[in-house]
């Protein structure tokens, strides 16, 4: 039994890191393998993660961690019984994938303005709380070409757009994702999408 693709890990910079790897053949990850991990810190203890299958030869492990700080470094040991298959380390702050924003809501009761709001996925004491920027994706269910991205580079988790920038009388969907420039993170997953019917009063044409 050998590791074909070494574990690669990403952290949500809060409490969970996810490591994935591939074996050289079909493997029952949960019964055959164990991933041991430990924060390099005087007051830390070793933890064991039981991996799940992720395709025939693929394995994935969700590591429960202490609140992350930038200096953290974890040792990782992948075991098959008594055999050490791989040894490595992981700095969560260097491989961050933020949590997805939640509670995306479209407020249509403001006169001819759409207000989209969502929740920051981090608590206020987390470093990323004040460092996230967002991308909002809005698309038409009727017209695949009607697809747009709004970059929200300020801290407030909201976006205002004129209803008239979208077509009237049809349904739209929106979703939002996040990233943090400070740690050069990847984008988060998209939030669940929300749907609304876009309607507004067309201004009278002057002749």
């Amino acid at each position: 039994m050998k590791v074909l693709q070494e574990p690669t890990c990403v952290s949500d910079y809060m409490s969970i890191s996810t490591c994935e790897w591939k074996m050289n053949g079909p493997t029952n990850c949960s019964t055959e393998l164990r991933l041991l991990y430990q924060l390099v810190f005087l007051l830390s203890e070793a933890h064991t993660c039981i991996p799940e299958n992720n395709g025939g030869a693929g394995c994935v492990c969700h590591l429960l961690m202490d609140d992350v700080v930038s200096a953290d470094n974890y040792t990782l040991d992948l075991w098959a019984g008594q055999q050490l298959l791989w040894k490595g380390s992981f700095k969560p702050s260097e491989h961050v994938k933020p949590r997805a924003p939640g509670n995306l809501t479209v407020h249509t009761n403001v006169s001819d303005t759409l207000l989209l709001t969502w929740s920051n996925p981090y608590p206020p004491d987390n470093y990323l709380y004040n460092h996230l920027t967002y991308a909002v994706n809005i698309w038409s269910e009727n017209d695949p070409a009607d697809f747009r991205i709004y970059n929200v580079t300020y801290l407030e988790p909201s976006l205002r757009i004129a209803a008239s920038t979208l077509k009237s009388g049809i349904s739209y969907r929106a979703r939002v994702r996040a990233w943090a420039q400070c740690y050069n993170t990847t984008w988060s997953e998209w939030s669940p999408s929300t749907k609304w019917h876009n309607s507004y009063r067309e201004p009278f044409e002057q002749h």
């Epitope: 005087l42 202490d66 930038s70």
Partner: antibody, heavy 115, light 109 residues
Framework: EVQLVQSGGGLVHPGGSLRLSCAGS????????MFWVRQAPGKGLEWVSG???????SYADSVKGRFTISRDNAKNSLYLQMNSLRAEDMAVYYC?????????WGQGTLVTVSS | EIVLTQSPGTLSLSPGERATLSCRAS???????LAWYQQKPGQAPRLLIF???SRAPGIPDRFSGSGSGTDFTLTISRLEPEDFAVYYC??????????FGQGTKVEIK
């Protein structure tokens, strides 16, 4: 807002015991290492003890065998049981959250050791 | 055990002046594990700098940290009245734990 609120200081005779408490709020207590740091009157800061999220502990040589640090994650609380107290243990004791450094501190509680 | 020595013991300066505080370690310290604190009379210490040079949230940019190995510096570019206080450096070591310097008092000249 992260807050650490301390209680339990006071006057104790040499050789006596005292228990300090620290209640945390505004953060996930169970995912953070916690510490006690003290400051003798007119002196500098001295690290006393720390406890990890899994319960691993460490102590300064000056208090080893006499002080015991513990935590109750269900109550978001940190404790320091101080036994066989000496005159040199007299100080303001601070609880703190942190790891390699201490990012949030309690308000401090004075422990006076005097006969 | 790593010993941290701060200098000077007292720094007498006027508001608006630049303050340079030194912290010297008896052996090499990882930049990741060097921090600076400010303490005012009757108050708990406040984290200013971690990782030798990163400002803690809410700390004004007139505070900056630098250095590596055994020599570290806290600089206050332009002293404000509220900056007169005692400043401590602190290090963490995987085997020995946490130690503080003896402090530098920044007082009004």
């Amino acid at each position: 807002e992260v807050q650490l609120v301390q209680s339990g200081g006071g006057l104790v005779h040499p050789g006596g015991s005292l228990r300090l408490s620290c209640a945390g709020s505004g953060f996930t207590f169970s995912r953070n290492a916690m510490f006690w740091v003290r400051q003798a009157p007119g002196k500098g800061l001295e690290w006393v003890s720390g406890i990890g999220t899994g319960g691993a502990t460490s102590y300064a040589d000056s208090v080893k065998g006499r002080f015991t640090i513990s935590r109750d994650n269900a109550k978001n609380s940190l404790y320091l049981q101080m036994n066989s107290l000496r005159a040199e243990d007299m100080a303001v004791y601070y609880c703190a959250r942190g790891r390699y450094y201490f990012d949030y501190w309690g308000q401090g509680t004075l422990v006076t050791v005097s006969s | 055990e790593i010993v941290l020595t701060q200098s000077p013991g007292t720094l007498s300066l006027s508001p608006g002046e630049r303050a340079t505080l030194s912290c010297r370690a008896s052996q090499s310290v990882s930049n990741s594990y060097l921090a600076w604190y400010q303490q005012k009379p009757g108050q708990a210490p406040r984290l200013l700098i971690f990782g030798a040079s990163s400002r803690a949230p809410g700390i004004p940019d007139r505070f900056s940290g630098s250095g590596s190995g055994t020599d570290f510096t806290l600089t206050i570019s332009r002293l404000e009245p509220e900056d007169f206080a005692v400043y401590y450096c602190q290090q963490y070591d995987h085997s020995a734990g946490w130690t503080f310097g003896q402090g530098t008092k920044v007082e009004i000249k």
